[in-house]
Every structure is written in structure tokens, then in C-alpha cells.
Interface confidence: low
């Protein structure tokens, strides 16, 4: 399918001009390549009429131009002084030949309709109203006034001053006069439809002395606005219907042959195909509203219409606005899983894409709620606090520059199931929808923390261990301290080897975190997690409470108040070639200086690695040495 898009049908009248906009995908090659407009012949050949290389055919000389707008990824063909000879089939396209990527456009140029010379033309949109002005001489002031619509043979009454009204105009037509002016009467017709278009005659008086006026009423369907959007991106339909329908229910529907199927309305109706990815937002008291759809699919392409009516459904004779949506499958938005599955008590790590050109933009994660018109309250964001009800179990990790940020939610419950949106304060096309499904857990979690009821004693040493299965052996383990500004990774002390192991003892794989000495600020949520580079995996959370020492309990003298927390990894490795544990000098010994950091579970290898800090919570700084990795208060 060609990714070029433009208007399918363009109509005009002789002597007028047209402006045709064609869209192309956002690539450097497309921006610079030749653009053309050609006419299709009976043989199937397409003859160039104008191109961006400067070519202009004889028949377009002096009346056409082609302008490329690379910043919008569009080019425009303007043609003036149209004649009926211009009616035909055309292509707008890209490429060095006219067999490149293109879009078919049908142009129809009609004759100017012949109207009686004194005809007044009124041009109105469907659903709007018209007020026809009918002047008359003073002597006809007492006479009957009327408006009739011309049919083939006769003139069918619409309304007259004796209050006769044609049945198809009841409730829509009014005949009135303004103030004391006795030389003009008016007829207002509301809720205009295509059937109302035509020639009318207004008349005051009878016979040869009657005053008559010819009126041509043109009722136009709105020209569809073209919307060119990438697959998986989002689109906003901005609908402005005017004050007269401000209090009516609003809707957006999609054309389906002869009918228009409602996708969403302000009365709570919503097409299941759009569940989790649509919002309708009343904008103000002037009849303006917008509909936002995220996660665009191929099948979302089509003809859309917005409108207003008390029923929340399309109704003839009510104002509408229309769009033609094209979904470009050559999308710049990466293809990510749209469904993420978790289990109760477990966790999910959701990778949210954003425009890599906007790495400094603020990132958000919101939960789509379908009640009412639908809305998406933000749960977490960069430079923002996590909503209270998600305390200890939600964090956003921004990885600047790589076009992805990660949202982690743990301690899952079935109530977390639903739709979530990734969005930024930058490029709105990059709003994506994720459905989170949460099933009941049927087995033990992959990560388990011991002790589970964690209460640390002020001033003492406290260690928690996180057990992980062998399948996580090669992944990076981390502990982080959660705050409502994020989960800040603690420097780790990796005691384990990283080469492949011959066997793995399921029971002894653990990463420990030690607080020494415990202070009041240590109270709070901690996460144990695994990651591979910038790809985050499972997490589990534990709340560590801190209480005063009871009398008689042992006392650790905090010889170095800077030595606060350390994270050590213990792994079982069977490799007879490595038998000695290295001993390193400690430049700034802390309270652990004279003890082994961990029991020597197996043969150790490789230099210990420190995982970089992802930022400091609560204004604390952190440092690490080659062997001991301390967390300073």
C-alpha cells in the first residue's frame, strides 16, 4: 500500500482554482526527492503536468505551481483558471519516474450553473441555518408574503404569512419581519439538509404587481480535513460545531458505507474496538470538543464525522465536521507489545517509547478510565511524585537518549488490570497504550525477600536478602530505595562470578543489602530487582520499619557514619580453575573492615563491579570503593 495520501475527490467550478495537498512519510529521502502531479490517460500512462524539478507542461503554463513543504512532509499543487477540460484522474507522487509512490486524485470541474440574473446565492453548511431576505414595495405591505421552492413544473410552498408551512419544514421554517421596517420580510430555515438545496422564490402580493425575488440556496457537506498519522501513533479530532449546539450531546462516528457508526459519545457510548485508547473531552461552552485516539491501527483508517444531537447519534440536519484519516504503516514508532501480563504479587516492567529527539521531555504514565467521557489521571512522571495509592510499588526510570523509559509496577493485584498510557509533554503522536492483564499467581514468585517482616533497630546492623532463581543468574541484580520521586539504585558489591556456570544451586542465589548502622531515614520501601543493561525485569518490594533499640540490646558503635548500606551478591559457581578469593586493600575502612563481606559460598572470580547510582534520593550522596560499596548519609 502506498504511503502517499491526498484528497480522493476534488470538485470545483469553471474559472475557480483548487489547492491539492499530498502527504508523504517523514524521511530525509522523501523530503528531497522529486514530487510530481500527473494526469492518467486511457492507456494507464501518467503524463507529468508539473514537478518539483521545475517542469511545467504547456497546458499548465501560467496557471499552476507545486510547492514542497518538507517541514510538514507535504507538497501542494495549486491550479487556477479551471476549465471542464481539467476534469479527470490524476496522481500526486514521489520519485524519479511517475511509477513511484503515488495517490490517485479525481478532479471534477463543473459548469457555472445558469441562474436568473437577479438571483441571490446563499451558501451554507449542512446542519446550519439560513435567513433569506425578501424585499418588497410598500404597497404590498398588507399582502400575503410567502417563500416557495421551485420544482420541475411548479413552486412548492415552504411557508407563508398566514402560517401555512410545508410538512417537511415544520419546526424549521419561520417567516418574520424586523422592527418597523415594512419593506422586507425574512424567512429562516434551520437544520439544513442536502434536500433543502435549490431555487426558491420569495413573493409579496399577488398578480402582476407582486414583488418577487429569486434565491439559490446551496447546502454544502463539509470538506473532509485530511489527517496523516503513523501506525501506533495518536490522533486528535478537534471538533468545533458552534454555540448553537453547545448543550447537545457530542459524538464521533466512522463512515461505514451508508451509515456512520458511533465510536464514542458524551452519553457514555463507546465502541469496544477503542476500549482503553480513546477519550472525548468537552473543551468549553462554545460547542468545541476533541476526541483523542491512541495506538492507531491499520483498520482505524477511514472517514470520520463529529456532530452533536441530544441522542448522541448522527442526525440529518445537524452540524457536522469530517476527516479522512490515513494510517501510514511505515511508522517511526517502534512496535512494542500492546499487552503486558503479570501475576498477583508479582511485577511488570513496561517499556514506553518516546521521540528520541525529545529526550529531555517530561515522561508520564497514566491510567485510562472509561467512566464518563473517559480520562487518564497521571500516576507517575519524571520530576513528579507518585500518586499516594501507589506508594512503594510504582516508579519511572528514565533512560535519557535511547527513546525508551521504563515504568515498573509491583505488588500487583487484579485491580491493577486495565489500560495505561505512556505519554510525554512533547510529541503527542508518541502516546501509546498498554493493556495490563493480571492473573492469579499459581506458583512462588521469582524473587523473594527474607526476612519478610522487616524491622530494623536504630543504630544496629540490618541485612535483608533477595533470593533469585538460576534463570536470572546472568542478569544484573540491584537494590533500590523507593521514594515518591523514583527508586534510586544503591551501589552494589558483586561477589559473584559472571562466567557461565556448570551448575547452579537454586537455594543459594541471593543478593543482600546491609544497613549499618540503621538510622531513622532508612525506614521505607526497598526494591530488589533484575535488569539486563537498560532493560528492567522483575522486582519485589519490602517495607523496612525502623524502631528504637530496647534496653539491653547489643550496640554497634558507628565508627564511620558514612558507611551506611551495602549490597552484595552471592552466587554458586563451580569452576575448579579459580580457587582463591582476592584480598584488596580498603582505602577508607568502615565498620566492616575486619570481616569478610559475605560467606565464601563458592569459588569467586572477576573484579567486583559497582552498579552506577541512578540518582540520589532524599539528597543523600553515595560512594563506592573497590571492595566495599557504602551508602553515605
Amino acid at each position: 500500500k502506498s504511503p502517499i495520501f491526498g484528497p480522493q475527490e476534488v470538485s470545483s467550478i469553471e474559472g475557480d482554482s483548487v489547492s491539492i495537498t499530498c502527504y508523504y512519510p517523514d524521511t530525509s529521502v522523501n523530503r528531497h526527492t522529486r514530487k510530481y502531479w500527473c494526469r492518467q490517460g486511457a492507456s494507464g500512462m501518467c503524463t507529468t503536468l508539473i514537478s518539483s524539478n521545475g517542469y511545467l507542461s504547456k497546458e499548465y503554463s501560467g496557471r499552476a505551481n507545486l510547492i514542497n513543504f518538507p517541514e510538514n512532509n507535504t507538497f501542494v499543487i495549486n491550479i487556477e483558471q479551471l476549465t471542464q477540460d481539467d476534469t479527470g484522474s490524476y496522481k500526486c507522487g514521489l520519485g524519479t519516474s511517475n511509477r513511484g509512490l503515488s495517490f490517485d486524485v479525481s478532479l471534477e470541474v463543473s459548469q457555472v450553473p445558469e441562474l436568473p440574473s437577479d438571483t441571490h446565492v446563499y451558501t451554507k453548511d449542512i446542519g446550519r441555518n439560513v435567513t433569506i431576505e425578501c424585499p418588497f414595495k410598500r404597497e404590498n405591505a398588507p399582502s400575503k408574503k410567502s417563500l416557495c421552492k421551485k420544482t420541475n413544473q411548479s413552486c412548492e410552498l415552504v411557508i407563508d404569512s398566514t402560517e401555512k408551512v410545508n410538512p417537511s419544514y415544520i419546526g424549521r421554517a419561520k417567516l418574520f419581519m424586523k422592527g418597523t421596517d415594512l419593506t422586507v420580510f425574512y424567512v429562516n430555515i434551520s437544520h439544513l439538509t442536502h434536500n433543502d438545496a435549490g431555487l426558491y422564490i420569495c413573493q409579496a402580493g399577488e398578480g402582476p404587481s407582486a414583488d418577487k425575488k429569486n434565491v439559490d440556496l446551496q447546502v454544502l457537506a463539509p470538506e473532509p480535513e485530511l489527517l496523516y498519522k503513523d501506525l501506533r501513533s495518536s490522533v486528535t479530532f478537534e471538533c468545533d460545531l458552534g454555540r448553537e449546539v453547545a448543550n447537545e450531546a457530542k459524538y464521533l462516528c466512522r463512515m461505514n458505507k451508508e451509515t456512520c457508526d458511533v465510536i464514542i459519545n458524551t452519553l457514555g457510548k463507546r465502541d469496544p474496538d477503542f476500549e482503553g485508547r480513546i477519550l472525548i473531552t468537552p473543551k468549553d461552552d462554545n460547542g468545541r470538543f476533541s476526541v483523542l485516539i491512541t495506538g492507531l491501527r491499520k483498520e482505524d483508517a477511514g472517514h470520520y464525522q463529529c456532530g452533536a444531537h441530544s441522542s448522541g447519534l448522527p442526525q440529518e440536519g445537524w452540524p457536522i465536521q469530517t476527516w479522512q484519516l490515513f494510517v501510514n504503516e511505515e511508522s517511526t514508532i517502534p512496535n512494542r507489545r500492546s499487552v503486558v501480563k503479570g501475576v498477583t504479587g508479582g511485577s511488570v516492567a513496561i517499556a514506553c517509547p518516546y521521540n528520541p529527539k525529545e529526550s529531555s521531555s517530561l515522561k508520564y504514565w497514566c491510567r485510562w478510565e472509561g467512566d464518563g467521557n473517559g480520562h487518564c489521571p497521571v500516576l507517575v512522571g519524571t520530576q513528579a511524585q507518585v500518586q499516594e495509592e501507589y506508594e512503594g510499588r510504582l516508579a519511572l526510570f528514565d533512560q535519557p537518549g535511547n527513546g525508551t523509559y521504563t515504568v515498573i509496577l509491583n505488588q500487583l493485584t487484579t485491580e491493577d488490570a486495565g489500560f495505561y498510557w505512556c505519554l510525554t509533554n512533547g510529541d503527542s503522536r508518541w502516546r501509546t497504550t498498554i493493556e495490563l492483564q493480571v492473573a492469579e499467581a499459581t506458583r512462588e514468585p521469582n524473587l523473594e525477600v527474607t526476612p519478610q517482616n522487616a524491622t530494623a533497630v536504630l543504630g544496629e546492623t540490618f541485612t535483608v536478602s533477595c533470593h533469585y532463581p538460576c534463570k536470572f543468574y546472568s542478569q544484573e541484580k540491584y537494590w533500590c530505595k523507593w521514594s515518591n520521586k523514583g527508586c534510586h539504585i544503591l551501589p552494589s558489591h558483586d561477589e559473584g562470578a559472571r562466567q557461565s556456570s556448570v551448575s547452579c544451586d537454586q537455594s543459594s542465589q541471593l543478593v543482600s543489602m546491609t544497613l549499618n548502622p540503621v538510622s531513622k531515614e532508612d525506614e521505607g520501601w526497598y526494591w530488589c530487582g533484575v535488569k539486563q543493561g537498560q532493560t528492567y525485569g522483575e522486582t519485589t518490594a519490602i517495607y523496612i520499619a525502623v524502631e528504637e533499640r530496647t534496653r539491653g540490646s547489643s550496640h554497634v558503635n558507628p565508627t564511620d557514619a558514612n558507611a551506611r548500606a551495602k549490597v552484595a551478591l552471592e552466587e554458586e559457581v563451580v569452576d575448579s580453575s579459580i580457587s582463591e578469593k582476592e584480598n584488596k586493600a580498603i582505602p577508607n575502612p568502615g565498620p566492616f573492615a575486619n570481616e569478610r563481606e559475605i560467606q565464601n559460598v563458592g569459588d569467586q572470580a572477576q573484579e567486583n563491579r559497582a552498579s552506577g547510582d541512578a540518582g540520589s534520593a532524599d539528597g543523600q550522596s553515595r560512594s563506592s570503593s573497590s571492595k566495599h560499596h557504602h551508602h553515605h548519609h
Partner: nanobody, 123 residues
């Protein structure tokens, strides 16, 4: 969560003026539109005025030309200057805010609400 705290309500004579203020705290990144709604005794809550982060405003017909809404994005405050007050302006005035993707009509799109401040206009 976003907290909204109103101030400036009170008793005023018809024809007088009052200035209401509202301060937002908490997850203020979530705020797009801020505004004022009111509820007179026995009546439904109705829009008074709203303002977007970009400064676009919208007023109820009944207050146009008399009330002015303004906003300080840096301080996350919104104010309502009420001049030429009438007895029918008597109501509890609520500060409200919308999330990043919410809209507003008669307040059904609002994500966050203040507790309200009473404005009484005596004749």
C-alpha cells in the same frame, strides 16, 4: 495526588469586589486546565471560568465582563477577580484542575477539586 486550597471568600455588598485564590500542591505536573466552579444552595454545580496552561480562557455567560481568571504556572496558582458582584453570585466556589489529558465542561472532566470557599453577596 493534587491538593487544591482556596482562599479569599467572604461577605460583600452587591456591586463590590472579591478576589479568590487557589494554590495547587502535590503532583502538579498532572495539571493542565485550572478553573473555578460554583454551587448555589439547591442548584447544580456550574462552570464559572477556566484557564489552560497556555492561557486560553473560557467564562460562563453570566460572569463575562465582570470576572477575570488568571494563572501563575510557576507558582501553580489560579485567581478569580470578581467585580460588580450580584446577589445571584452567592455560592460555594470550588477550585478545580484537570489532568494532562482531561477536558472540562460542567466539571465532569475535572480530576481534582478543592473543598470550596463561600462567597455571599448581600443586597
Amino acid at each position: 495526588q493534587v491538593q487544591l486550597v482556596e482562599s479569599g471568600g467572604g461577605l460583600v455588598q452587591a456591586g463590590g469586589s472579591l478576589r479568590l485564590s487557589c494554590a495547587a500542591s502535590g503532583s502538579i505536573f498532572a495539571i493542565n486546565g485550572m478553573g473555578w466552579y460554583r454551587q448555589a444552595p439547591g442548584k447544580q454545580r456550574e462552570l464559572v471560568a477556566v484557564i489552560t496552561r497556555g492561557g486560553s480562557t473560557n467564562y460562563a455567560d453570566s460572569v463575562k465582563g465582570r470576572f477575570t481568571i488568571s494563572r501563575d504556572n510557576a507558582k501553580n496558582t489560579v485567581s478569580l477577580q470578581m467585580n460588580s458582584l450580584k446577589p445571584e453570585d452567592t455560592a460555594v466556589y470550588y477550585c478545580a484542575a484537570t489532568g494532562v489529558l482531561a477536558g472540562w465542561a460542567a466539571g465532569d472532566g475535572m480530576d481534582y477539586w478543592g473543598k470550596g470557599t463561600l462567597v455571599t453577596v448581600s443586597s
